[in-house]
Interface confidence: medium
């Protein structure tokens, strides 16, 4: 198996951002909301997620990944057109199968450069490489048929489609190695709100004990949980009211199918 020594995009590595504000550090501001936003990271030359507090901050803040990339990555839209026209596949499509370091059992798909097709493989649950897709369709769009692909070369970030490693919550042990469990969430077609409202409560990594609220999409209610002060996910609100206001609107009434794994 061959692997990349460095997974940053060399094509972008030497470029300067399009706007000066793209060089600013992510600034969550002084307020306490938990708003998923994106910023351009000057060091990694990628647009990355951060949590915005809801007020102040700076201009290096975008509502969507796409908007961030269009604004801050030089040549991003040209690259997108090139990929859509079938000129080239992302480099990671050519990486060989890598189940990663853990010993879980997750059904994933990779692009096989020998057969020129996307194929199923078993992913162990953490790290590994970027030739790793949750669905056959996603693999095909990005690696097999980039001619018809709406996904630009730089669009793919592992975080968009792979759940790696050990979360602090929702875990089980396989062969003495902790591996992640798929969170039990309502079917996405029954929920049209913010995607993070579907995430399970995550107490995070630190040692504090802060009262927070998370939205339970199965019940349509916001429940209390203890947050440890860092890490975790975006389904985390300082008040029940803020939680309901952010997440309740997305529930489609009378269509709940319970939970799926």
């Amino acid at each position: 198996l061959s692997e990349e020594a460095d997974d940053t995009d060399s094509e972008l590595g030497s470029m300067k951002p399009l706007h000066t504000f793209c060089a600013m550090k992510a600034d969550d501001g002084p307020c306490k909301a938990m708003i998923r936003s994106y910023f351009f990271n000057m060091y990694t030359h990628q647009c990355e997620e951060f949590i915005y507090g809801g007020c102040e901050g700076n201009e290096n803040r975008f509502d969507t990944l796409e908007e961030c990339k269009k604004t801050c990555i030089p040549g991003y839209e040209k690259t997108a057109v090139k990929a859509a026209s079938g000129a080239e596949r992302p480099d990671f499509c050519f990486l060989e199968e890598d189940p990663g370091l853990c010993r879980g059992y997750m059904k994933r798909y990779l692009y096989n450069n020998q057969t020129k097709q996307c194929e199923r493989f078993v992913y162990g649950g953490c790290l590994g490489n970027r030739n790793n897709f949750e669905t056959l369709d996603e693999c095909k769009k990005i690696c097999e048929n980039p001619v018809h692909s709406p996904s630009p070369v730089n669009e793919v970030q592992m975080s968009d489609y792979v759940t790696d490693g050990n979360t602090v919550t929702d875990r089980s042990t396989v062969n003495n190695i902790v591996v992640p469990q798929s969170p039990k969430v309502p079917r996405r077609r029954d929920y049209r709100g913010r995607p993070w409202c579907l995430q399970p409560a995550d107490s995070g990594l630190c040692k504090a004990s802060e009262r927070r609220f998370y939205y339970n999409s199965a019940t349509g209610k916001c429940h209390r949980f203890n947050y440890t002060g860092c890490g975790g996910n975006n389904n985390n609100f300082t008040t029940r009211r803020r939680c309901l206001r952010s997440c309740k609107t997305g529930l489609i009434k009378n269509k709940s199918k319970g939970v799926v794994k």
Partner: antibody, heavy 121, light 107 residues
Framework: QVQLQQSGPGLVKPSQTLSLTCAIS??????????WGWIRQSPGRGLEWLGI?????????HYAVSVKSRITINPDTSKNQFSLQLNSVTPEDTAVYYC???????????WGQGTLVTVSS | DIQMTQSPSSLSASVGDRVTITCRAS??????LAWYQQKPGKAPKLLIY???SLQSGVPSRFSGSGSGTDFTLTISSLQPEDFAVYYC?????????FGQGTKVEIK
């Protein structure tokens, strides 16, 4: 160029907590393409991997079984650094402690300068 | 845990010599192996990853080979700056583990 700068005390008393910090420049602790680990080195044990954290939409961690009950590795996104806490130390925890960056694959391509921590009363 | 055993534990060689160090894993780790060089008072430096891929900036006199359980690091023509301790590391599964090291000394 990625650089890792370690800080923390060189002497810790038995039963106390060892705390070290690793400040990152040239990369981001919450990068989607990196992982951040601690490794220690002592004459008796050689190089010993202690644990790793990484961010992929949320934070994940893996710890060595030998220290699992005593170790915490935390990110600090506001300061772009990560820390090691090792509780209830004994003289056997005396070692040079290194922080290091791993890429996707679990190989350590950048290392801190190392901190000799002596556990002694 | 996967045990990594290096041999020899030390060797003496002269500048210009071809040097070979081996690393054996206690189970099949495919090609999930790295080699590091460490000089006194310094942190280890990544030389080879994925058993045979040369890390950026590392001189081409260093090469790695092997797969499964047996791996080799070769220095084709030893230079004065190559006298150091060399370690292998597996990343096939957690916990990540290192070999005990091979010290390359001046003859």
């Amino acid at each position: 160029q990625v650089q890792l700068q370690q800080s923390g005390p060189g002497l810790v008393k038995p039963s106390q907590t060892l705390s070290l910090t690793c400040a990152i420049s040239g990369d981001s602790v919450s990068s989607n393409s990196a992982a951040w680990g601690w490794i220690r080195q002592s004459p008796g044990r050689g190089l010993e991997w202690l644990g790793i954290i990484y961010y992929r939409s949320k934070w994940y961690n893996h710890y060595a079984v030998s220290v699992k009950s005593r170790i915490t590795i935390n990110p600090d996104t506001s300061k772009n650094q990560f820390s090691l806490q090792l509780n209830s130390v004994t003289p056997e925890d005396t070692a040079v402690y290194y922080c290091a960056r791993s890429n996707w694959s679990g190989y350590f391509d950048y290392w801190g300068q190392g901190t000799l921590v002596t556990v002694s009363s | 845990d996967i045990q990594m055993t290096q041999s020899p534990s030390s060797l003496s060689a002269s500048v210009g010599d071809r040097v070979t160090i081996t690393c054996r894993a206690s189970q099949d780790i495919r090609n999930n192996l790295a080699w590091y060089q460490q000089k006194p008072g310094k942190a280890p430096k990544l030389l080879i990853y994925a058993a045979s891929s040369l890390q950026s900036g590392v001189p081409s006199r260093f090469s790695g080979s092997g797969s499964g359980t047996d791996f080799t690091l070769t220095i084709s023509s030893l230079q004065p700056e190559d006298f150091a301790v060399y370690y292998c590391q597996q990343r096939n599964g957690f916990p990540l583990t290192f070999g005990q090291g091979t010290k390359v000394e001046i003859k």
